[in-house]
């Protein structure tokens, strides 16, 4: 057959679905690779073809759309499983073509099993809630398009293994789960199971997400430099190692980039000739406030180095701060023999 623009295996779209549940998978061509949508392609006389390579096989084969109860079907640019089976796992390809044009992309589909508490190899999305911030909601994700608006599904929410009922501050409200006042104890995995009827059958959609309670923007402050500070003086003799830690506390801020850097005489360490190394470590509190420590190290400090200005800088979405380290050369202790000789006027 003639050439086909092959976008390869789109591993960015590692699709995971639960066994025995419906799955609707859109052909990624129209979402990520082509500049037109399915309707435009269809009206232009292009045909969408699906095929797959099952797990641990090399052979591409057509998808069987003649299974009992139309278990696998295609609707426009969507491949439907009603429901999935474990051995549906494999690489799926959608190809758009006519006599003069061809474009295709493959993507991996993994059908996974869950245990009795909804644990599975599924990668879970993380939803962050602000601590003690008032009412916040999470919504059962990725259930659009599975049933028409005329169908009223039932939704059951779980925290870990347990149905959410009679919780003090967590209330199920259909597709939403409301947290009246989020606390650290609300951290965990939350699962919604949506049950709906279709053509005389009952289907279930299980969606699990991780809730992480984080620092509230109400409590956020600009970066705080704990070290260097005015109480510690770095007094060194030439030839000794100089170690200066810069320790900065950052309040949690959604999507904020936290930065810490040193300047020496107003320049970045990379831009000067001294042999400086900087090591960084990061730790987080339970609410994802961040403490960054950058240790500036000069193995064998010179008297010139001890006259320089060492400034620690920090920046977040809340502001920028800087603090200079107090560095000085240690005055050598008087040597007794020399002082005595000088005292007697020796030459």
């Amino acid at each position: 057959s003639e050439r086909c623009d092959d976008w390869g295996l789109d591993t960015m779209r590692q699709i995971q679905v639960f066994e025995d549940e419906p799955a609707r998978i859109k052909c990624p061509l129209f979402e990520h690779f082509l500049k037109f949508n399915y309707s435009t392609a269809h009206s232009a006389g292009l045909t969408l073809i699906w095929y797959w390579t099952r797990q641990d096989r090399d052979l591409e084969e057509p998808i069987n759309f003649r299974l009992p109860e139309n278990r696998i079907s295609k609707e426009k640019d969507v491949l439907w499983f009603r429901p999935t089976l474990l051995n549906d796992t494999g690489n799926y390809t959608c190809m758009l073509r006519n006599t003069t044009y061809c474009s295709k992309v493959a993507f991996p589909l993994e059908v996974v099993q869950k245990d009795s508490c909804f644990n599975s190899p599924m990668k879970l999305p993380v939803h962050k809630l602000y601590i003690e911030y008032g009412i916040q909601r999470i919504t059962c994700p990725n259930v659009d398009g599975y049933f028409p608006s005329s169908v009223k599904p039932t939704i059951t929410w779980y925290m870990g293994c347990y149905k959410i009922q009679n919780f003090n501050n967590v209330i199920p409200e259909g597709m939403n789960l409301s947290f009246l006042i989020a606390l650290i104890s609300n951290n965990g995995n939350y699962t919604c199971v949506v049950t709906y009827p279709e053509n005389g059958r009952t289907f279930h959609l299980t969606r699990t997400l991780t809730v992480k309670v984080v620092g509230s923007p109400k409590n956020a402050v600009p970066p705080v430099i704990h070290s260097p500070n005015d109480h510690v003086v770095y007094e060194k003799e030439p030839g000794e190692e100089l170690l200066i830690p810069c320790t900065v506390y950052f309040s949690f801020l959604m999507d904020s980039r936290n930065e810490v850097w040193w300047t020496i005489d107003g320049k970045k360490p990379d831009d000067i000739t001294i042999d400086v190394t900087i090591n960084e470590s990061i730790s987080h509190s339970r609410t994802e406030d961040e403490t960054r420590t950058q240790i500036l190290s000069i193995k064998k400090v010179t008297s010139e180095d001890l006259k320089r200005s060492y400034v620690c800088h920090a920046r977040s979405a809340k502001g920028e701060v800087a603090k200079a380290a107090k560095v000085k050369q240690k005055v050598p202790a008087p040597r007794y023999t020399v002082e005595l000789a000088c005292g007697f006027g020796a030459t």
Epitope: D20, D115, S116, K163, T202
Partner: antibody
């Protein structure tokens, strides 16, 4: 379509054990709960316990704890309920019932167990 | 264990009648209530889950409602094939428990 086919009727002596099987088809056996419910002649329904074949997790009603054992064989998609130390009050129809969550969506046809000396 | 009390224990009604069966729990069950239908000599069948969710394939003349401790199953227009015993079942807290059943007959 979901089908649960149970083993045939049993007549047992008091003090003995009975093991009832329930063969499942038409759904992913590992991913649903299998419940066991019994019904004494002319009486209501009584939940005994359940098993999740995927990980073997079980829950039992206090009344049957220690006397009932639920197991599942994933390779044959078959669930088993064994009831020991039988007494005449255990004469009943025993049902298996599959539930993706907690409701029992589909039931087996039932197995009559008669305990008589 | 949560006790489930059903009433009436039996009723007789004419074809086309509206029939109501109630179920009361000994404590709040947060809508975690199912209704099952059992015809003579047959296994039970799920009619309604989570108080009001009609199970697939169940005729729309069956409906459920309620909250807290009190729940209702309604048959809007009784049909001859509805002759059966109806059971409520709570699944709020293990062990799951059933009501005593309501036998529905045709006059």
């Amino acid at each position: 379509q979901v089908q649960l086919v149970q083993s045939g009727a049993e007549v047992k002596k008091p003090g003995s054990s009975v093991k009832v099987s329930c063969k499942a088809s038409g759904y992913a056996f590992s991913s649903s709960w299998m419940n066991w419910v019994r019904q004494a002649p002319g009486q209501g329904l009584e939940w005994m316990g359940r098993i999740y074949p995927g990980d073997g997790n079980t829950h039992y009603a206090q009344k049957f704890q220690g006397r009932v054992t639920l197991t599942a064989d994933k390779s044959t998609s078959t669930a088993y309920m064994e009831l020991s130390s039988l007494r005449s009050e255990d004469t009943a129809v025993y049902y298996c019932g599959e539930g993706y969550l907690d409701p029992m969506d589909y039931w087996g046809q039932g197995t009559l167990v008669t305990v008589s000396s | 264990d949560i006790q489930m009390t059903q009433s009436p224990s039996s009723l007789s009604a004419s074809v086309g009648d509206r029939v109501t069966i109630t179920c009361s729990a000994s404590q709040g069950i947060n809508n975690y209530l199912n209704w099952y239908q059992q015809k003579p000599g047959k296994a039970p069948k799920l009619l309604i889950h989570y108080t009001s969710g009609l199970h697939a394939g169940v005729p729309s003349r069956f409906s459920g409602s309620g909250s807290g401790t009190d729940y209702t199953l309604t048959i809007s227009s009784l049909q001859p094939e509805d002759v059966a015993t109806y059971y409520c079942q709570q699944y709020s807290i293990l062990p799951w428990t059933f009501g005593g059943g309501t036998k529905v007959e045709i006059k």
